[in-house]
């Protein structure tokens, strides 16, 4: 397929990479697949500076990331590696917490509304970001 | 004009599969998500899938999950769906459909005029 | 899954009638439904997406309202080309999901 060289409608470009941020709520899941299927994923924050851009663009608004436990150790949706990768949790997070009374802990991190992460139920439904690189070998998107 | 054209429908007998295909034209097809939607005899419709622009991505129907594949080939302007393990319930019109252009619109604008798939035995 | 539930799922009517037909999603789905019709032995037309907009070329006889989980089809003045089977759809999470099916027929 061709290279996508600039980034679909109503998404916004930022540092060779288009993100677009949703104004509604779904589970983690649901915007998962939302993501997926515009050919992208859920945002993979590789750097302070891409973490105070989505944080500026995000607002003070809990809003999923493409990070999670859901089967067992800590995962960035893309593959990239998050042992050794940027990370910003709240201070004591991320708890696993049981006790919010919803079955289970809690394994989808989320940026808070002061942009430092926490883990949370996947099933709340937050605001998500999606991410896609730009030059990687794909089919254009489409424009309305 | 757009078009969407099915072909690949016949009987089948059960656990036996099929591959339809779907032949798309007046419309840039690699900038568009596709469906596939099946309707039973005297029934309704009900979402069998959907496919991403590149083909990177696909969702099923629990109902088909693990039995039916779909796929494009953007350089041939074609669709498939291969369909394997077939079930007497499988039996329907199976109607290929392009989605609706807008970022999260999963709506189906364009339908093709749908092809037939019987299992019986 | 989101449960879409259409009713009535058959309906007798004259031509000039005013007819309406209701969606009720089991979840919010914000704006996220269509309408499509369906004449036998054909395949589904859109007609009306994200609740209220219509698609290209569709008469202004046919509206959709709602949003939430409550939603509506009307045609307001009935013709005798608008006796057929209306689907609403919802597309705000996958599965994506139909309603059963509204019959319009000729009384």
């Known amino acids: 397929g061709s290279e996508r060289t600039c980034c679909p409608v109503n998404w916004v470009e930022h540092e060779r990479s288009c993100y677009w941020f949703s104004r509604s709520g779904k589970a983690w899941a649901d915007a998962d697949n939302y993501c997926r299927l515009e050919d992208a994923h859920l945002v993979v924050v590789t750097s302070w500076e891409e973490q105070k851009f989505v944080q500026h663009h995000i607002g003070p608004v809990n809003t999923w990331m493409g990070l999670h436990d859901q089967n067992g150790p800590w995962k960035w949706v893309d593959g990239t590696d998050y042992e050794t990768g940027f990370k910003n949790w709240r201070p004591e997070q991320p708890d696993d917490w049981y006790g919010h009374g919803l079955g289970g802990g809690e394994d989808c991190a989320h940026f808070t509304d002061d942009g430092r992460w926490n883990d949370d139920v996947c099933q709340r439904p937050y605001r998500w970001v999606c991410e896609t690189e730009l030059d990687k070998a794909s089919q254009e998107p489409p424009l309305l | 004009q757009v078009q969407l054209v099915e072909s690949g429908g016949g009987v089948v007998q059960p656990g036996r599969s099929l591959r339809l295909s779907c032949a798309a034209s007046g419309f840039t097809f690699s900038s568009y998500g596709m469906h596939w939607v099946r309707q039973a005899p005297g029934k309704g419709l009900e979402w069998v899938a959907i496919?991403?622009?590149?083909?990177?991505?696909?969702f099923y129907a629990d109902s088909v999950k693990g039995r039916f594949t779909i796929s494009r080939d953007n350089s041939k302007n074609t669709l498939y769906l291969q369909m394997n393990s077939l079930r007497a319930e499988d039996t329907a019109v199976y109607y290929c459909?392009?989605?609706?252009?807008?970022?999260?619109?999963?709506?189906?604008?364009?339908w093709g005029q749908g092809t037939t798939v019987t299992v019986s035995s | 899954d989101i449960q879409m539930t259409q009713s009535p799922s058959s309906l007798s009517a004259s031509v000039g009638d005013r007819v309406t037909i209701t969606c009720q999603a089991s979840?919010?789905?914000?704006?996220?439904l269509s309408w499509y019709q369906q004449k036998p032995g054909k395949a589904p037309k859109l007609l009306i997406y994200?609740?209220?907009n219509w698609e290209t070329g569709v008469p202004s006889r046919f509206s959709g309202g709602g949003s939430g989980t409550d939603f509506t089809f009307t045609i307001s003045s009935l013709q005798p080309e608008d006796f057929a089977t209306y689907y609403c759809?919802?597309?705000?999470?996958?599965?994506?999901?139909f309603g059963g099916g509204t019959k319009v027929e000729i009384k």
């Open positions: 459909a392009r989605r609706i252009a807008a970022a999260g619109h999963y709506g189906m604008d364009v």
């Open positions: 496919i991403s622009y590149s083909g990177r991505n696909d």
């Open positions: 979840q919010d789905i914000y704006n996220h």
């Open positions: 994200d609740a209220s």
């Open positions: 759809q919802q597309y705000e999470n996958l599965p994506l999901t």
